[in-house]
């Protein structure tokens, strides 16, 4: 039903859903701090633009008795319950920030007349792609898929002279919310990734993964998995690995690789880590002081959600346009705004663009080094290290299928 919005006459409210089920196990207090810090910045920016208006946030907490698992897999109805609560209280802001779980976002989007914008720190799954009033401020699965396909096909770099068309995907069902949806997208038979690969098999058991590492009859040398180095070590341990195996470890929201004193453990030498380029200023910020490197991105997405709203509010107010219109609801895309940590770009569908970084372990220094970067906005790979000190033969990435012979540049059309 249509709920009146507290969103006019110089007073603009943001509804922040504080859900028990969340993409990352972040104390709600930290998210509140991030939102409040964002509000301070927005107020300052509006004031500097000569706009004398009030911007506030209302935090909507769900009933912990009903939704207390903290697990996104059980979150389908929580968002709807919160919306009902908002509806009953007749308290809807100009914009909805949260939810972060794919299930609840999808359900809310399906079951409500969304005449207001929805900003999510999460909602990683493909089912939340191409939603007209949904903005996602953490890299969704679609962006990962496009990188992987781009990288698989690349065959003209000094360190990658074969295009690949095969892969194993390790997915055992215990993954974090981001990994769950990333791997889900790679597994889906109708996804772009599956469509572009000739062979893809999902490994679901630890033993399956462990056996592949030395199996002479394996169908691919490439294994994709998602998580941190510790997750890989628990699975792989110090087992021997065939020399032409390449493990791609997707670990987007983890800054630990970029700490100065980090040395790569020995078990990472056959691994390429895909992560996001680290921000510049976050380490000293007041809201992130208590956050682990993994959680920083989640709280930052809440903060940036507030800044995005402030950006759009400023534009609409300066143009004398109404905020409670479908035009406003559909405007949160195809733009760049000043985020907390520098410019943030949203694509045509409201999904954040970013620079992904592929790291390798130098056999000389045992340090992580950047192999290449990938710009999700233009779907392009930029090599950085033209002569990497790889563990692989001739310091080049192997073919994805052993014994394929000299099919040096097999192209896919």
């Amino acid at each position: 039903s249509q709920v009146s919005q507290n969103c006019h006459n110089g007073s603009y409210e943001i509804s922040v859903l504080m859900m028990g089920n969340s993409a990352f196990a972040e104390p709600l207090k930290n998210l509140e701090d991030a939102v409040n810090e964002g509000l301070e910045i927005v107020r300052g920016r509006l004031q500097n633009a000569g706009l004398n208006v009030t911007v506030n946030a209302t935090f909507m907490y769900s009933d912990g008795l009903i939704h207390n698992s903290g697990d996104c897999r059980s979150s389908t109805c929580e968002g709807l319950d919160l919306l009902r609560k908002i509806s009953n209280a007749q308290r809807m802001g100009c914009v909805l920030i949260g939810p972060s779980c794919t299930y609840s976002t999808f359900q809310m989007y399906l079951d409500t007349e969304l005449s207001y914008p929805m900003i999510s720190a999460g909602s990683f799954g493909l089912s939340c792609d191409y939603k007209e009033t949904l903005t996602r401020l953490m890299s969704p699965a679609r962006k990962l898929m496009y990188f992987l396909v781009n990288f698989w096909k690349t065959n003209d770099l000094p360190f990658k002279t074969y295009s690949w068309s095969t892969s194993y995907v390790y997915k055992n069902g215990t993954e974090t919310e981001d990994c769950f949806w990333y791997l889900n997208a790679l597994e889906a038979s109708v996804s772009y990734f599956s469509h572009e690969l000739g062979f893809k098999v999902v490994l679901r058991q630890d033993k399956e993964f462990q056996d592949i590492l030395m199996d002479h009859n394996r169908k691919s040398n490439v294994i994709i998995m998602c998580g941190g180095p510790e997750f890989l070590y628990k699975l792989k341990g110090d087992r021997a690995v065939a020399e032409d195996i390449v493990i791609i470890l997707v670990d987007l929201f983890n800054d630990q690789y970029f700490e100065d004193n980090v040395t790569a453990p020995d078990y990472m030498k056959n691994v390429l880590v895909l992560t996001l380029s680290p921000g510049n200023s976050l380490l000293n910020s007041s809201f992130s002081r208590n956050l682990s490197p993994t959680k920083r991105d989640f709280a930052l997405a809440y903060l940036n959600g507030i800044l995005l709203f402030g950006h759009m509010l400023k534009i609409f107010l300066e143009n004398g346009e109404n905020i409670t219109t479908p035009k406003f609801a559909h405007a949160f895309r195809n733009l760049t705004f000043e985020g907390y940590d520098g410019p943030v770009t949203l694509d045509d569908w409201g999904d954040v663009d970013s620079t992904m970084v592929l790291l390798y372990t130098s056999v000389d220094t045992k340090k992580y080094k950047v192999l290449l970067t990938y710009d999700t906005h233009v779907n392009k790979t930029y090599p950085v290290d033209m002569s990497p000190t790889f563990t692989w033969k001739n310091s080049k990435l192997p073919n994805d299928i052993t014994g394929r012979g000299p099919q040096h540049h097999h192209h896919h059309h």
Epitope: F258, T365, K369
Partner: nanobody
Framework: EVQLVESGGGLVQPGGSLRLSCATS????????IGWFRQAPGKEREGVIC???????KYADSVKGRFTISRDNSKNTLYLQMNSLRAEDTAVYYC?????????????????WGQGTMVTVSS
Amino acid sequence: EVQLVESGGGLVQPGGSLRLSCATSGFTLDDYAIGWFRQAPGKEREGVICLTSGGLPKYADSVKGRFTISRDNSKNTLYLQMNSLRAEDTAVYYCAASGATSRWNCPPQYDHWGQGTMVTVSS
């Protein structure tokens, strides 16, 4: 002795591309952060790109999406690939190096500088 020698400058039309090289000697690239700077006639020198010793590129907003940096340790050389060049990119381009105190951050200042190479973007 640390040395940096730039090359690859020249005259190019708007929308065109150039690749600048910075040949280095006297140090290991892995231990140094490298920056590309430029100075347009009558203007102050400005940072364009820095590559941290860990290999993380950091771009000035004015060149993001157009310029990219790479390095080849086997040749002790850094490259600045410049695409979609504009008239305002006309400048002398300098390569600079600094012993890295952090693997992932650009240094506040650089100790060693090359002589520069001129890039002119004009039709």
